[in-house]
């Protein structure tokens, strides 16, 4: 959590940042909040990016105001234009690419005052692993696949019945680059699988931790699955 | 209320080019983009190019040797031009806005200008 | 690019009846999709956007649906005024691209 006041001048009013992760391809948030004001047409919104010479997002006096913004994200911006009344600055973003990640500014005006924190924006991608029986394999074998990761992360099989055990003899990882030439899909085989057990398959880099639960018994298989982003803290 | 009115000639000759102005109220061209879609008789639409707040523009492929989109804010106006028309250009034109900044749909459309292009 | 699949190309309805138009892309759009009537002589009418948020203005029998490459406009209860062209369109990533169109018929 980022919190920042306004430096310049008398009057300083506090804005909130909360750092986050974008997943390639879909939109995401850029969380900011501010201490409202009772006009709308009083509150200033500027969304600024370390490096970049335009304007990310500007609203004013009620509406948005694009006539600055930078190429990069011509259309791909809006703010929940509802909700800055009461507080509410956060920015959706279109389509997340790579290279949106950087350091942010979130800067408000209102009549208390101005105000600007700051928020890290890493991009990446990360999906929910699957974790399944392979019927087709010569001995219990079990099947771990998410489709979307970026960049390569780690993964790591773990038991219920042998904790602390290390499981990288018996296990194949591989990562198959998709079309997009960017992201990749995870595939990691446990071998030498015993019933009566609950194994997990964890797959991390440095934006998520995802983790695919599978219990085996003889009469039943119950999956389940978790995902976690790993660098959400406000500013 | 919002609205974009479109004016152009209806009469093009073979390999001239075509020019259509959109100008548009309730809204001002510093928010948002505005969008160019064709509908050729029968055919489905097809998306041309947008002019955005900040000017800069993105053009389909297809037609990006020979599309030109400006604007001019003041006079809340949207100037489209296309060189080097055949008769398969034939069509209505459509200027449109996005019903959000981030272009989730075209919530507004000009009345359109349909072209024909005939010796 | 990507390309917009509608289905049917056409259908005929009696009125009260409901309606399922199919719009399928070629690739992910998540949800980016959004749904145009366009009656003769017409310019085209935003029904649906951000695949399933039905735009100001529109009656509720409208409702779209779906996410990533497979989405559907529904009209739950058909009226004669409903006999139009209807378009899908992606805005997800450039160029933008439309379908061919349904074309809706009443008995």
């Known amino acids: 959590l980022i919190i920042g006041f306004g430096i310049s001048g008398r009057h300083s009013i506090t804005v909130t940042t909360v750092a986050s992760a974008g997943n390639i391809g879909e939109d995401g948030i850029l969380s900011c909040t501010f201490e409202p004001d009772i006009k709308l047409s009083d509150i200033v919104i500027q969304w600024l990016k370390e490096g970049v010479l335009g304007l990310v997002h500007e609203f004013k006096e009620g509406k948005d105001e694009l006539s600055e913004q930078d190429e990069m994200f011509r259309g791909r911006t809006a703010v929940f234009a509802d909700q800055v009344i009461v507080g509410n600055a956060s920015l959706r973003l279109k389509n997340v690419q790579l290279t949106d990640a950087g350091t942010y500014k979130c800067y408000i005006i209102t009549s208390k005052g101005k105000g600007n924190a700051n928020l890290e924006y890493k991009t990446g991608a990360f999906s929910m692993p699957e974790v399944n029986v392979d019927y087709n394999a010569s001995s219990e074998t079990l099947r771990c696949e998410a489709p979307r990761w970026f960049p390569q992360p780690t993964v790591v099989w773990a038991s219920q019945v042998d904790q602390g055990a290390n499981f990288s003899e018996v296990s194949n990882t591989s990562f198959e680059l998709n079309s997009e030439n960017v992201t990749m899909k995870v595939v990691s085989v446990l071998y030498n699988v015993t019933i009566n057990n609950t194994y997990s398959c964890m797959i991390e880099n440095d934006i998520a931790k995802a983790t695919g639960d599978i219990k085996v018994t003889e009469s039943e298989i119950k999956r389940r699955s978790h995902l976690q982003l790993l660098n959400s803290k406000a500013s | 209320q919002i609205q974009l009115q479109q004016s152009g000639p209806g009469l093009v000759q073979p390999s001239q080019s075509l020019s259509i102005t959109c100008t548009v109220s309730g809204f001002s061209l510093t928010s948002y983009g505005v969008q160019w879609v064709r509908q050729s008789p029968g055919k489905g639409l097809e998306w041309l190019g947008v002019?955005?707040?900040?000017?800069?523009?993105d053009y389909n492929a297809a037609f990006i040797s020979r599309l030109t989109i400006t604007k001019d804010n003041s006079k809340s106006q949207i100037f489209f031009k296309m060189n080097s028309l055949q008769a398969d250009d034939t069509a209505i034109y459509y200027c449109?806005?996005?019903?959000?900044?981030?272009?989730?749909?075209?919530?507004?459309w000009g009345q359109g200008t349909l072209v024909t292009v005939s010796a | 690019n990507i390309v917009m699949t509608q289905s049917p190309k056409s259908m005929s309805m009696s009125v009260g009846e409901r309606v399922t138009l199919s719009c399928k892309a070629s690739?992910?759009?998540?949800?980016?999709v959004s749904w145009y009537q366009q009656k003769p002589e017409q310019s085209p009418k935003l029904l649906i956007y951000?695949?399933?948020n039905r735009y100001t203005g529109v009656p509720d029998r409208f409702t779209g649906s779906g996410s990533a490459t497979d989405f559907t406009l529904t009209i739950s209860s058909v009226q004669a005024e409903d006999l139009a062209d209807y378009h899908c369109?992606?805005?997800?990533?450039?160029?933008?691209?439309f379908g061919s169109g349904t074309k809706l018929e009443i008995k």
């Open positions: 951000g695949a399933s």
């Open positions: 002019i955005w707040s900040s000017g800069n523009t």
């Open positions: 690739e992910n759009v998540g949800t980016y």
């Open positions: 449109a806005r996005d019903i959000t900044t981030i272009v989730e749909g075209f919530a507004y």
């Open positions: 369109g992606q805005t997800y990533s450039y160029p933008f691209t």
